[in-house]
C-alpha cells in the first residue's frame, strides 16, 4: 500500500537568483486532484494554498513580494491528495543578490584567445567576503566557486569553443547572499581545430570545482528556462 505520493517539482521564476527588494514566485507542481500545497522554508511552514478546483490544477505559485536576506535560503514543497501527503520536493536554494558591493571581473590573457590557450578569470571585491562565484550565462548556469581574501582566481585550463560565452562573478557573503553581479566579460575562443559541431553546449569542468547542472527528464516537463531545483540544488553543495 502506497504511503506517500511522488514528490512535487519546485522552481523559482524568473530565477533562483533574486535581486534584493524584487519579487520572486516559487512554483510547485504536484498532481491534479491535490487539495493542498505547502511551501516550507528552512524546515518551517511558510505558505499554504488550496487550489480550486483541484482536479483542474496541478501547479500553484507562492509569492515573495520583497526579496531580502531573511527570505534567502532553502525551500521545499509538498502536496496532499485526500489524506495522503507527498514526499517533499527537492530543495530549492533561493539566493538574494545585489547585496552591498560590485566585484570586478577580468580575464587573462584577455577576452579573445585561441583554442588550447590557458585562460584564468579573476574576480575582485574589496569588502569582507572570502568566497566568490563565477557564472557562465546560459541555460545550464554553470557556477564555479573560488576563495581568496579580496580576489579569487578561476583557471579554466586550455579552452575550447565550448568555453565561449558571457561570464559574470559575484562575491558571496554567505551561501544565500551574493553581491551585485560584476560587469559581464565575453570570452571569445577562435581557431579551434576540433569539429565545433560536436562541441558540447557547455564545457565539462573538474568535479571538485564545477557543478554540472544537466537538464533531466523532470525538466522536460516545464519551460526550458525553468531549471527547477537542479541548478540551485547542486549550486551550493
Amino acid at each position: 500500500q502506497q504511503q506517500t505520493l511522488p514528490k512535487p517539482f519546485i522552481w523559482a521564476e524568473p530565477h533562483f537568483m533574486v535581486p534584493k527588494e524584487k519579487q520572486v514566485t516559487i512554483c510547485c507542481q504536484g498532481n491534479y486532484g491535490a487539495v493542498e500545497y505547502q511551501l516550507h522554508f528552512e524546515g518551517s511552514l511558510f505558505a499554504v494554498d488550496r487550489p480550486k478546483p483541484p482536479e483542474r490544477i496541478n501547479k500553484v505559485q507562492f509569492y515573495i513580494p520583497d526579496m531580502n536576506s531573511r527570505m534567502a535560503g532553502q525551500y521545499s514543497c509538498i502536496y496532499r491528495v485526500g489524506e495522503l501527503w507527498s514526499e517533499p520536493s527537492n530543495l530549492l536554494d533561493l539566493v538574494v543578490t545585489e547585496m552591498y558591493d560590485t566585484p570586478t571581473l577580468s580575464v587573462h590573457p584577455g577576452p579573445e584567445v585561441i583554442s588550447g590557450e590557458k585562460v584564468t578569470f579573476y574576480c575582485r571585491l574589496d569588502t569582507a567576503t572570502s568566497m566568490f562565484l563565477l557564472l557562465k550565462e546560459g541555460r545550464s548556469s554553470h557556477v564555479q566557486r573560488g576563495y581568496g581574501k579580496v580576489q579569487a582566481e578561476f583557471p579554466l585550463g586550455p579552452v575550447t569553443t565550448a568555453h565561449r560565452g558571457t561570464y559574470r562573478c559575484f562575491g558571496s557573503y554567505n551561501n544565500h547572499a551574493w553581491s551585485f553581479p560584476s560587469e559581464p566579460v565575453k570570452l571569445l575562443v577562435t581557431g579551434d581545430i576540433e569539429n565545433t559541431s560536436l562541441a558540447p553546449e557547455d564545457p565539462t569542468f573538474p568535479a571538485d570545482t564545477w557543478g554540472t547542472y544537466l537538464l533531466t527528464t523532470e525538466t522536460g516537463l516545464q519551460k526550458d528556462h525553468a531549471l527547477w531545483d537542479h541548478t540551485a540544488q547542486n549550486l551550493l553543495r
Partner: nanobody
Amino acid sequence: EVQLVESGGGSVQAGGSLRLSCAVSRGSMASTGCMAWFRQTPGKEREAVAIINISGTTRYTDSVKGRFTIAQDSAKNTLTLQMNSLKPEDTGMYYCAATQNPRTVGRGYCTGDYFQVGGGGYSFWGQGTQVTVSS
C-alpha cells in the same frame, strides 16, 4: 506604508477570555492581503496562530482551533482576535501583521485559500501586546 497598533492584552486566569484588537492606520485594510496574529513565547519561534486572507477565509494553528476567532472589521479598519478558554501555554507576546496587497504581488496571493504562514512573508508589523494566562 501601513501602520498596525495592537491593544487588548492583559492578565487573565486560565479558562478566561481576552479580545485583542489591531488598528490599521496610514492606509487601510484594502492595502493589505493576509492579516494574522502571531504569538511569540519564550524559547519558541514566533508562530502564526490565526490568519485571515483577503477573501475572508481563515486558518488557525491546531492548538487554538475552536478557542480563538480572527475577524476583520473593514469599516473600522480593525483586525480582532477573540480568545476564549485561555490556557497558560497561550501566554506570550501577540503581534498583528499584514502582507502586501495581491494587486502589487500576483493574482492568487492571499486570496481564495492562500495563506501566508511564515513571518518572513509579512511586510507590516505592530509592536505587540502581552497576554499572560495564569493557572
